[in-house]
Amino acid sequence: MVPPPENVRMNSVNFKNILQWESPAFAKGNLTFTAQYLSYRIFQDKCMNTTLTECDFSSLSKYGDHTLRVRAEFADEHSDWVNITFCPVDDTIIGPPGMQVEVLADSLHMRFLAPKIENEYETWTMKNVYNSWTYNVQYWKNGTDEKFQITPQYDFEVLRNLEPWTTYCVQVRGFLPDRNKAGEWSEPVCEQTTHDETVPS
């Protein structure tokens, strides 16, 4: 009896949908695997007789529930199927946005770039897919624990009237208010303000 794949899960970030599993212990030799998806009542092969422990399902529609399954094989024997269901638009992880930061005196000017949908030629982004897309920004004075959060209305934001000659750190994530779903934070970007622009009287 061939044991089934273990720890079967979907690793999906920005609609790059990778089904992953672990090979079970099997004394007779090396196992291969077949992974399939349900397409209108029929299971279709996606990865056949692969020695890998992952399979790319990124071509599946972003919308609706999908049933995926994988089994282990050895010679003419095979394990039972292990099934999972997956809805990309609900389940994919929203990766960190890009962010450009520029210091102008005592202000930080930030521009946000929504993460791209993976493995597509065009520049479609996660913002295209989710109507309610917005950004959360958090910033703090470097070396302190207190963080401030804002929700910009646009793809840019300006933090004004900051302390001069002080390093501030900023990070951004995507947020979907209608789903109460937050994406991953970008890596912090830290920049030092310069002087304030007030002219002494």
Epitope: Y37, L38, S39, Y40, Q44, S58, S59, L60, S61, K62, Y63, G64, H66, I117, N119, E120, Y121, E122, W124, N128, V129
Partner: nanobody, 126 residues
Amino acid sequence: QVQLQESGGGSVQAGGSLRLSCAASGYTYSSGCMGWFRQAPGKEREGVATINSDGSTNYADSVKGRFTISKDNAKNTLYLQMNSLKPEDTAMYYCAAEPYCSGGYPRWSVAEFGYWGQGTQVTVSS
């Protein structure tokens, strides 16, 4: 909400032609992948022709040289020109769309398209 509405089906003699149309609302054809599928009685739904946002096309072997898929982005309409029709082309024809898709993957199965029309019947008699 994306809605697709097919039209242009009907009955025709073998060797004849039909032009199917698919009008979209809530969706822009230039922003995704589109396809025509068909389903004959007692058979599975199968891909007939697909077109990507860049205009590149794919056809099932059984219709190559006879069918042409095209789209008019300005009218937000997808077309399937069917020539030299055969009795085996008899089926319900469905329009399908997958928004924000460009052709990074070849899409050819039902599960790869998220939105569907109600279908239009094509009957070819010998």
